[in-house]
């Protein structure tokens, strides 16, 4: 806290200017009128203040606006906004994109601090939901932006906004927040063709059902390893051999290289042996010739 | 993302006079408080002048009284006029976005001044 203290003869700042930069902690706080501050507020970023004078500008501030900073004076913080901590933000109304990108360009190459965190919250709280350009400026500052939402979160999600996302988007998504997330791709992207569709969905597909996959199987869509990997093991389970190889075309061979990993493991063991022979691949551990494959859960669900 | 792109230097004779831009894109220019700072081999980079996103300028020591920096808001284009140049003011000129503490920064243009 800065001691109140007179404002010397002279000092009264009319303006805030280069001459400031001069000014002692307490003299600022003494001598320049919080109102002018908040008028004039852009010029603060072009001043070099000591880091220690911008902590007296923001004591104004905070007294002038007890309640929290109005927009026009937010969108003027610049690097002011780092010393703002997670209880200032949550005061702030922040309706404009512009401010947001603004504030957002200040952050810029840091990790999501706890205030951007918070500002990006009260941000999409007071939209109501993750509108298309939203999603496009925190993904573009935030990559790992969407994976950082709750599957609750994400339900507020658009179908529309989907277009904005791109596949490096959703490289740290979890299947229960692909969950989310796929039925909304599969509801934007409904009207593109067959292999455009395909691009589009693969990177959602981690939270596609059985029946989406075996409608892409019949496609040609050629599906990756990688993507197969991604798929959701009860999703792959009922597959049979011809569709993951109809799913995979001439991917199929990578299946040898991932026998010992989820979901190839798993599916592998519900697999007839000898439909496993006809890849030719040399896959091992599915069920013997011979033998009779009770599905449990299906006897669970008639009794 | 951001890119600054600045222009209009080369090469002049002491007391000549250039004028830079710096055209931006991928920021809110007009939120931005803008600047132009310059570094001369061995030298430390140094703020030449900034310029508040409502047109309010500061003028460093380094250049002070022989500079103008304007903007176009419009055109997301920032300027440096430069006049009565000396050899001294040699150096390779940045545009900066952010104001006295810059977030980002331009490639660089090189001013060189013949005596």
């Known amino acids: 806290e800065v001691e109140k203290t007179a404002c010397p003869s002279g000092k009264k700042a009319r303006e805030i200017d280069e001459s400031l930069i001069f000014y002692k902690k307490w003299e600022l706080e003494a001598c320049v009128d919080a109102a002018l501050l908040a008028t004039q507020m852009d010029r603060v970023n072009a001043i070099p203040f000591t880091y220690e004078q911008l902590d007296v500008l923001k004591h104004k501030l905070d007294e002038l606006y007890p309640q929290g900073y109005p927009e026009s004076v937010i969108q003027h913080l610049g690097y002011l906004f780092l010393k703002m901590s997670p209880e200032d933000i949550r005061k702030w109304n922040v309706t404009s994109l512009e401010t947001l990108k603004a504030l957002l360009e200040v952050n810029k190459g840091h990790e999501m601090s706890p205030q951007v965190a918070t500002l990006i919250d009260r941000f999409v709280k007071g939209r109501g939901q993750l509108d298309k350009d939203t999603l496009d400026t925190l993904t573009a500052f935030y990559p790992g932006y969407l994976c950082s939402l709750s599957p609750e979160e994400l339900s507020s999600v658009p179908p529309s906004s989907i277009w904005a996302v791109r596949p490096q988007d959703l490289d740290t998504c979890d299947p229960r927040q692909l969950d989310v997330l796929y039925p909304k791709a599969r509801l934007a992207f409904q009207n593109m063709n067959g292999s455009e569709y395909f691009v589009k969905i693969q990177s959602f597909l981690g939270g596609a059902p059985t029946e989406d996959l075996k409608a892409l199987s019949q496609q040609n869509v050629s599906m990756d390893l990688a993507t197969f990997m991604k798929l959701r093991t009860d999703a792959v389970l009922p597959l049979t051999v011809a569709e993951v190889q109809k799913l995979l075309g001439p991917h199929v061979e990578g299946l040898k290289a991932e026998e010992r990993h989820r979901p190839v493991r798993d599916w592998i063991l519900r697999q007839r042996q000898d439909d496993l022979d006809t890849l030719g691949l040399g896959l091992q551990g599915g069920i013997p010739n011979g033998y009779l494959v009770l599905d449990l859960s299906m006897q669970e669900a008639l009794s | 993302q951001v890119q600054l792109v600045e222009s209009g230097g080369g090469l002049v004779q002491a007391g000549g006079s250039l004028r830079l831009s710096c055209v931006a894109s991928?920021?809110?220019?007009?939120?931005?408080?803008m600047g132009w700072f310059r570094q001369a081999p061995g030298r430390e980079r140094e703020l030449v002048a900034t310029?508040?996103?409502?047109?309010?300028?500061y003028y460093g020591d380094t250049m002070s009284g022989r500079v103008t920096i304007s903007r176009d808001n419009d055109k997301n284009t920032l300027y440096l006029e430069m006049n009565s140049l000396k050899p001294e003011d040699s150096a390779m000129y940045y545009c900066?976005?952010?104001?006295?503490?810059?977030?980002?920064w331009g490639q660089g243009t090189q001013v060189t001044v013949s005596s």
């Open positions: 310029i508040a996103s409502g047109g309010w300028a």
């Open positions: 900066s976005a952010g104001g006295a503490r810059p977030h980002s």
């Open positions: 991928g920021i809110v220019f007009r939120l931005n408080a």
